[in-house]
Interface confidence: low
Amino acid sequence: MRWCLLLIWAQGLRQAPLASGMMTGTIETTGNISAEKGGSIILQCHLSSTTAQVTQVNWEQQDQLLAICNADLGWHISPSFKDRVAPGPGLGLTLQSLTVNDTGEYFCIYHTYPDGTYTGRIFLEVLESSVAEHGARFQIPLLGAMAATLVVICTAVIVVVALTRKKKALRIHSVEGDLRRKSAGQEEWSPSAPSPPGSCVQAEAAPAGLCGEQRGEDCAELHDYFNVLSYRSLGNCSFFTETG
């Protein structure tokens, strides 16, 4: 049995306003982010400061439903987005093959009991490649400058490593890869444990999900439950802190 923990924010948490008042929970999102045309981006929200039971998370773009992660039934990706949207990591959503038309507001809507509905907002701007290379305009300027500086330093280090051909090359390449991701305007994640594609887990130390083993295919229940073309083999999601 594989277990996985919620991927947690390494940086850049923003707090989104709640959908309605008097609820204790808060939705944490990346706020405004940007990505390069043709690339991919992770949209992620995290509900905290509440003991409410999450039963479903909806991802929407303006008035269009992109995806649903249901507590018992797993992931559903809207047919019109199935070729460009992938579930995860966690309760998040990965947008692929980005186009300029993907620019806009994205909403994560957490359905909970007994609190009700929480909504988080993310603004994504998809930049033309030439623009994106000069940094993401929506990132905090200081972080952007730091990232750019690190890229320059990192490039120099790589040149030195390539020339000297020392054994530490692999480790430096790994660091360089991380820095490239930062400079492209994507959020950095710090996984506490591996989170296989298609799984979604909210609670720390929560089990893999109500659909069982983490797989890149439907669990038996999903396959049995959804005899519908719009449901793909996307794995499953779990929201529960209780374990037997």
Epitope: Q56, L73, H76, H111, T112, P207, A208, E213, D224, G244
Partner: antibody, heavy 115, light 109 residues
């Protein structure tokens, strides 16, 4: 064929606990959720909670939170529903059902709470 | 909480007639998560229709389902004597995770 066989009727006093079993057969036990639903005399259906035997993940109806506990024994393909602090209004027939669609149901277990 | 309201509470019809049972949700739900069950006295509920319109295994095709958003309907095109029972709609995925309607009793006129 798929079957869910529940334990027999129970008579309990207020304040006591009851543990109802649901033995599954005819399918892969660890691949489907098992839900619990109850029905008071002459009333409708009320969902209590669900457990996924594959990893023991559970979810409960907030109304029963703290009073109901769902467990599963994969070695015997059996799910258990324990309801504590019983009161007279818990008198009902308790059903287990397979999967989100509840495509197969147990025969029901009558629990009577009376002093 | 998503509340499902079924109407009418009781429907009195004769064999051969058409029965139309309604289920309204207090807020919009996905049609994927709306199911119908039949229950006869002293018996366990039985799945009739899943995902709004899909016929469960072994259910005769005189039963059909439709609807979207907040309004859903179960139709029995031509009533047979064995169809007289209580019918429940159920939603999945709201909060609580599962809720049932109060039921419609289909009785012999």
């Amino acid at each position: 064929q798929v079957q869910l066989v529940q334990s027999g009727a129970e008579v309990k006093k207020p304040g006591a606990s009851v543990k109802v079993s649901c033995k599954a057969s005819g399918y892969t036990f660890t691949s489907y959720n098992v839900h619990w639903v109850r029905q008071a005399p002459g009333q409708g259906l009320e969902w209590m909670g669900t457990i996924y035997p594959g990893n023991l993940a559970t979810s409960y109806n907030q109304k029963f939170k703290g009073r109901v506990t769902l467990t599963a024994d994969t070695s015997t393909s059996t799910v258990y529903m324990e309801l504590s602090s019983l009161r007279s209004e818990d008198t009902a027939v308790y059903y287990c059902a397979r999967s989100g669609t509840m495509d197969y149901w147990g025969q029901g277990t009558t629990v009577t709470v009376s002093s | 909480e998503i509340v499902l309201t079924q109407s009418p509470g009781t429907l009195s019809l004769s064999p051969g007639e058409r029965a139309t049972l309604s289920c309204r949700a207090s807020s919009s739900i996905s049609s994927t998560y709306l199911h119908w069950y039949q229950q006869k006295p002293g018996a366990s509920p039985k799945l009739l229709i899943y995902n709004t319109q899909n016929l469960a295994s072994g259910i005769p095709d005189r039963f059909s389902g439709s609807g979207s958003g907040t309004s859903y309907t179960l139709t029995i095109s031509r009533l047979e004597p064995e169809d007289f029972a209580v019918y429940y709609c159920q939603q999945f995925g709201g909060y609580p995770l599962i809720t049932f309607g109060a039921g419609t009793k289909l009785e012999l006129k």
